[in-house]
Interface confidence: low
Amino acid sequence: ECVTQLLKDTCFEGGDITTVFTPSAKYCQVVCTYHPRCLLFTFTAESPSEDPTRWFTCVLKDSVTETLPRVNRTAAISGYSFKQCSHQISACNKDIYVDLDMKGINYNSSVAKSAQECQERCTDDVHCHFFTYATRQFPSLEHRNICLLKHTQTGTPTRITKLDKVVSGFSLKSCALSNLACIRDIFPNTVFADSNIDSVMAPDAFVCGRICTHHPGCLFFTFFSQEWPKESQRNLCLLKTSESGLPSTRIKKSKALSGFSLQSCRHSIPVFCHSSFYHDTDFLGEELDIVAAKSHEACQKLCTNAVRCQFFTYTPAQASCNEGKGKCYLKLSSNGSPTKILHGRGGISGYTLRLCKMDNECTTKIKPRIVGGTASVRGEWPWQVTLHTTSPTQRHLCGGSIIGNQWILTAAHCFYGVESPKILRVYSGILNQSEIKEDTSFFGVQEIIIHDQYKMAESGYDIALLKLETTVNYTDSQRPICLPSKGDRNVIYTDCWVTGWGYRKLRDKIQNTLQKAKIPLVTNEECQKRYRGHKITHKMICAGYREGGKDACKGDSGGPLSCKHNEVWHLVGITSWGEGCAQRERPGVYTNVVEYVDWILEKTQAV
């Protein structure tokens, strides 16, 4: 059962796992949610009746029954983890805490103009978990405007104390606001020989990399595969760090793989969700339950639905046994990973999917697309929407992309002459325009947010957000697309598609069925040569065939240029402008979304 409200002046008795320090009960709930075992917590607020050494303590708790006895205690605030909830969860915490000093290892001290600048510095520093900033009213002259960057083993403060005229806050890496590079490569036959901060068991290097990503101190990792010569180290995932933030030594070793934390790209790739099955593999751990199940998929569902289950092993039924049902072993451990991994015993193992909601919805795999052909099939581009205007009569105006459950990203130039959001309708999950009838459900638009530097498409800033009046329930036919990571600026996308209901040639009409075309990206240098009369800026991205023939056209504007990278689709461009349609040596020009990620996040995450 999902319980989101906090219980004031209430303490849960017993079940303690560990104590951490958090600046608020709200953040204590987030820490509990991300902890592999925590189901409940008790936070102690500052209060004259409480011992100051206990202020800001966040006690993480577990219980077999998923609840604990309640005791009245002033200044105690208790609650439940969001593990039991189905809604999307985020570790992003933009709050600034006034007059609080969050203690940790002060590894960097510098002057900053403001708390915001200090927070940005922390966000862009690979080691920083949180910061404390002494304001210009701070009593000690030599400490005024000092920004202290801090880290700890747990990522949370080692203590929090009251201190006048300082403010503290957390790194915004988990808000997708870091400019740090996003290095997704996994290096085969490589060992990073730096200090280990932790080690866990993992079935493959991808899971190891994801564990590294959400471990607060891990910057890179080395994984020993099941073919690693030293038996005791097989399937071992070593979580590592270094002072420089990069591996100091790389050693060539067969059957080992190494890679980096994906912290700065975690909003656009799955980090918590280990959805694969591992055949002929047994995960060992504390047994929670043994249940009969028809298949390993059914076993995974059982694990996902059992809030304390972290991973499972399924042993298929022996012929004619137990109505063809196998045994499903639901398991857990102190850190959420198997205590040992064994091969060759016939089991099929995997992880709970409960944690998938901690990843961005946009990373969910969508059904395979039909390659070739120009007409799309249902569910092929579930982020694509058709934006209609109802004035003077209803018709398709532009395309757009779902990027959040209340947000559509589109082009600014679509709204020239649109005086009010009231005349707009957003239709999602649509394949054919002819499906749209008077009674077809749509999303009303609450607000049109146009980039304030937009003048006309050709001069850039051709980007706009639509805030919907109601939220989109994600399904197979309507779900968001990931924004590109700022750390992915150097990625070369090779699988890019433009979609829309627009014209198929310059003299044409709106298409009934959503059209798609695979289009190669063109360098800005090459694009500039083709548009000598225009300035192709780094905030634009171009795509098209040299010989022409495939392109976006009228009516496609605002729609996505979607590129697949590492199995995840990213919204790389917004259809903006071009000379004619599909003309030879005239690529289409798109708004370069990666350059507007800050703007998008600022507008969509505004309180």
Epitope: L397, Y416, M456, G502, R507, K509, K554
Partner: nanobody, 123 residues
Framework: QVQLQESGGGSVQAGGSLRLSCAAS????????MGWFRQAPGKEREGVAV??????HYADSVKGRFTISQDNAKNMVYLQMNSLKPEDTAMYYC??????????????????WGQGTQVTVSS
């Protein structure tokens, strides 16, 4: 096949009025933009009036004298021309498109054009 057919042209004395009509056929959806352009002998074609998503835009030379209107149900666009002057003499063309405004109301971005109807204003 999309077709635009103008009608209503003719000869008129200066100060007189005419109403031009344009019927669009062969198109399932309403056009986002419909407009009137004109071309006098030996001159370049120029924009007269445009109706875009219900909002109207006029060339400075016709403001206050000409009125553009639209009947979406019939996919028709009209141009009511009052206080006509001899310099209004030209071939008048109807244009339509799913136009996204590209910085100029009277650019050459319209895909569909009619054959034109002649308007002659004598002094």
């Amino acid at each position: 096949q999309v077709q635009l057919q103008e009608s209503g042209g003719g000869s008129v004395q200066a100060g007189g009025s005419l109403r031009l009509s344009c019927a669009a056929s062969g198109y399932t959806y309403s056009f986002n933009s419909m407009g009137w352009f004109r071309q006098a002998p030996g001159k370049e074609r120029e924009g007269v009036a445009v109706i875009y998503l219900g909002s109207t835009h006029y060339a400075d030379s016709v403001k206050g004298r000409f009125t553009i209107s639209q009947d979406n149900a019939k996919n028709m666009v009209y141009l009511q021309m009052n206080s006509l002057k001899p310099e209004d003499t030209a071939m008048y063309y109807c244009a339509a498109d799913l136009l996204e405004y590209d910085g100029t109301w009277f650019g050459s971005t319209y895909n569909y054009w009619g054959q034109g109807t002649q308007v002659t204003v004598s002094s």
